[in-house]
Amino acid sequence: HNTTVFQGVAGQSLQVSCPYDSMKHWGRRKAWCRQLGEKGPCQRVVSTHNLWLLSFLRRWNGSTAITDDTLGGTLTITLRNLQPHDAGLYQCQSLHGSEADTLRKVLVEVLADPLDHRDAGDLWFPGESESFEDAHVEHSISRSLLEGEIPFPPTS
């Protein structure tokens, strides 16, 4: 799986979208989890409604919400009041039994509020970082990591 980077501003909301094949994942609940450390498990943050037919209903856990468009095949996660500690590696998952398939790996980046006594010139925006100069930008807050730019490279 490629990793897609979503950027949000501290104090604001960030929407993460995870597209999937609606036929392949028909009848499956979805979840959003956070990768703990380099080799740790993916800790469940929030999952869709227990009844798959009600997956369109938004479910909250703290400041994180999840909703699933099962016909269109798009899982949407909202992180409200984004904070620095929300930055990290996450996964969108499709659940079946005790197993979970990864729909998308997501790297959440939190930017400082440009209005919070900061100069816009100090902030980084997609396309301006040498590390990601060839990365594919899906929209204003999302981009894919290049091959080899994995967040948790093997320990040297």
């Epitope: 450390g37 620095p84 500690h85 930055a87 990290g88 590696l89 980084w124």
Partner: antibody
Framework: QVQLVQSGAEVKKPGSSVKVSCKAS????????ISWVRQAPGQGLEWMGG????????NYAQKFQGRVTITADESTSTAYMELSSLRSEDTAVYYC???????????????WGQGTLVTVSS | EIVLTQSPATLSLSPGERATLSCRAS??????LAWYQQKPGQAPRLLIY???NRATGIPARFSGSGSGTDFTLTISSLEPEDFAVYYC?????????FGGGTKVEIK
């Protein structure tokens, strides 16, 4: 075991700039916060700013905004802190520190460099 | 910015005594708080992270507690090597500020 090795002591003139390096070895680099902390003689610790190399975006304390630039080179596992328009009050030991956990939530400083003494004097 | 106020500024105690150091935040930092020990001429050393988790290799006599705005570092029985300056730091929001420090000195 992670090690952070900083560049050597510097003596600078007021108005000039200094660039201190911090090379990390013995562990991964990309997803861990690197913070820069300074300590003036006989004073406490002062957080200047930090960066997560994989993101490339640095965050700075208001006090240093516009004067400090923090960067990281993933290819060499090296972080840099450049402070410009130096004045005598900038005389201090400058430390780099790496988080013990990944990203900002793990930015408690588990590993520290040996410190770099920067003396600003005319 | 979040201001961390440490008290007392100086604590004069004898070896074997219990030391209680306080760190108060100007607003909630949840549990995103660390404690460091620093001796003269040395870099700081991490003692506690996430308010109550002891770092690897730190003796059990060091313990941290609290959440929100009030935090405590306790040294249950002071050893000669514990006399140093102690700092708290928050890392919930930028800038990641430090407290002014508490010096634990031999009485």
């Amino acid at each position: 075991q992670v090690q952070l090795v900083q560049s050597g002591a510097e003596v600078k003139k007021p108005g000039s700039s200094v660039k201190v390096s911090c090379k990390a070895s013995g562990g991964t680099f990309s997803s861990y916060a690197i913070s820069w902390v300074r300590q003036a003689p006989g004073q406490g610790l002062e957080w200047m700013g930090g960066i997560i190399p994989i993101f490339g975006t640095a965050n700075y304390a208001q006090k240093f905004q516009g004067r400090v630039t923090i960067t990281a080179d993933e290819s060499t596992s090296t972080a840099y802190m450049e402070l410009s328009s130096l004045r005598s009050e900038d005389t201090a030991v400058y430390y780099c520190a790496r988080g013990g956990g990944t990203f900002w939530s793990g930015s408690w400083a588990l590993y520290w460099g040996q410190g770099t003494l920067v003396t600003v004097s005319s | 910015e979040i201001v961390l106020t440490q008290s007392p500024a100086t604590l004069s105690l004898s070896p074997g005594e219990r030391a209680t150091l306080s760190c108060r935040a100007s607003q909630s930092v949840s549990s995103y708080l660390a404690w460091y020990q620093q001796k003269p001429g040395q870099a700081p050393r991490l003692l506690i992270y996430d308010a109550s988790n002891r770092a690897t290799g730190i003796p059990a006599r060091f313990s941290g507690s609290g959440s929100g705005t009030d935090f405590t570092l306790t040294i249950s029985s002071l050893e000669p090597e514990d006399f140093a300056v102690y700092y708290c730091q928050q890392y919930v929001n930028w800038p990641f500020t430090f407290g002014g420090g508490t010096k634990v000195e031999i009485k």
